[in-house]
């Protein structure tokens, strides 16, 4: 039975040209995290595999940095980066958990972090 929950940074905003850390955290389960996929809509950004290391998609190599931890750092943000991001946790033996983050990239210098929220 899958008992875990994913906590994410929720709705976040950042300035154009800046950077942002996408972070998820899996709690309430003893399952082992074996791989985390980071996706934007249907596009793969990066994968962190506990045994194999990191893979960064070639199309994002210049703007994506692994970490911190299982998170992902997006750099040189553009307005086109606005949208939904998903952290997909592959665990053993539970299975797959998915978290959602919405990023808004702002032209102005007013960019505040939204509240954290949980996805069961």
């Amino acid at each position: 039975m899958m008992t875990g929950t994913i906590e994410t940074t929720g709705n976040i905003s950042a300035e154009k040209g800046g950077s942002i850390i996408l972070q998820c955290h899996l709690s309430s389960t003893t399952a082992q995290v074996t791989q985390v996929n980071w996706e934007q809509q249907d596009q793969l950004l990066a994968i962190c595999n506990a045994d194999l290391g990191w893979h960064i998609s070639p199309s994002f190599k210049d703007r994506v940095a692994p970490g911190p931890g299982l998170g992902l750092t997006l750099q040189s943000l553009t307005v086109n980066d606005t949208g939904e991001y998903f952290c997909i946790y592959h665990t053993y033996p539970d299975g797959t958990y998915t978290g959602r983050i919405f990023l808004e990239v702002l032209e102005s210098s007013v960019a505040e972090h939204g509240a954290r929220f949980q996805i069961p």
């Epitope: 791989q35 996929n37 053993y92």
Partner: antibody, heavy 125, light 107 residues
């Protein structure tokens, strides 16, 4: 290019423990970030994943076999091994060792990239 | 666990014809799907990974498509060496699971 070679007894008695070894050549098992896996294929049937061990030492087993399976790595011999206890005739199969994730860092996929030739194990008294 | 179902179990095709093999997952695997070819007495060989990318050295007549739960392996023009059994497999969720296989035989 890494190469794999299975070895072990071709005949095992019921209730005993099946022990197989996979010898890795063409590279060091200790400096490679892969999953080392065992897969089997009963005569005339399909493929069944038995289990894998990661470079961190983490093991992952097929739930249907978990209570009977142990996979380990011996870096000094550049080998990894499979032990399957309390065997019965239904464990008769060709056993393959394989490498999973050899191209993960470049291409981001996890699949069984490299296979050994397989070794036939018969369980019979 | 994710159950992989392949169809048909056997496909009879004439050399030079097109072969279309199907694989269905019991739940979404995104594009985390591989295809293998196995000839009698040999170990399986990786053909396709990531649902659609050919492995090194695999001829262009082999192509994969699909995502989520429905996947297809197409062999555009069957050569004599292509008559074999083909398996699909999902990854990364544990446990790794294979489909039951499709045997492509000469018509």
């Amino acid at each position: 290019q890494l190469q794999l070679q299975e070895s072990g007894p071709g005949l095992v008695k019921p209730s005993e423990t099946l022990s197989l070894t996979c010898t890795v050549s063409g590279g060091s098992i200790s400096s490679s970030r892969y999953y080392w896996a065992w897969i089997r294929q009963p005569p005339g049937k399909g493929l069944e994943w038995i289990g894998s061990i990661g470079t961190s030492g983490s093991t992952y087993y097929n739930p249907s076999l978990k209570s009977r399976v142990t996979i380990s790595v011996d870096t000094s011999k550049n080998q990894f091994s499979l032990k399957l206890s309390s065997v019965t005739a239904t464990d008769t199969a060709v056993y393959y060792c394989a490498i999973e994730g050899a191209n993960f860092r470049d291409f981001g996929y996890v699949a069984f990239d490299i296979w050994g030739q397989g070794t036939m194990v018969t369980v019979s008294s | 666990e994710i159950v992989m179902t392949q169809s048909p179990a056997t496909l009879s095709v004439s050399p030079g014809e097109r072969a279309t093999l199907s694989c269905r997952a019991s739940q979404s695997v995104s594009s985390n799907l591989a295809w293998y070819q196995q000839k009698p007495g040999q170990a399986p060989r990786l053909l396709i990974y990531g649902a659609s990318t050919r492995a090194t050295g695999i001829p262009a007549r082999f192509s994969g498509s699909g995502s989520g739960t429905e996947f297809t392996l197409t062999i555009s023009s069957l050569q004599s060496e292509d008559f074999a059994v083909y398996y699909c497999q999902q990854s990364p969720p544990w446990p790794r699971t294979f489909g039951g296989g499709t045997k492509v035989e000469i018509k």
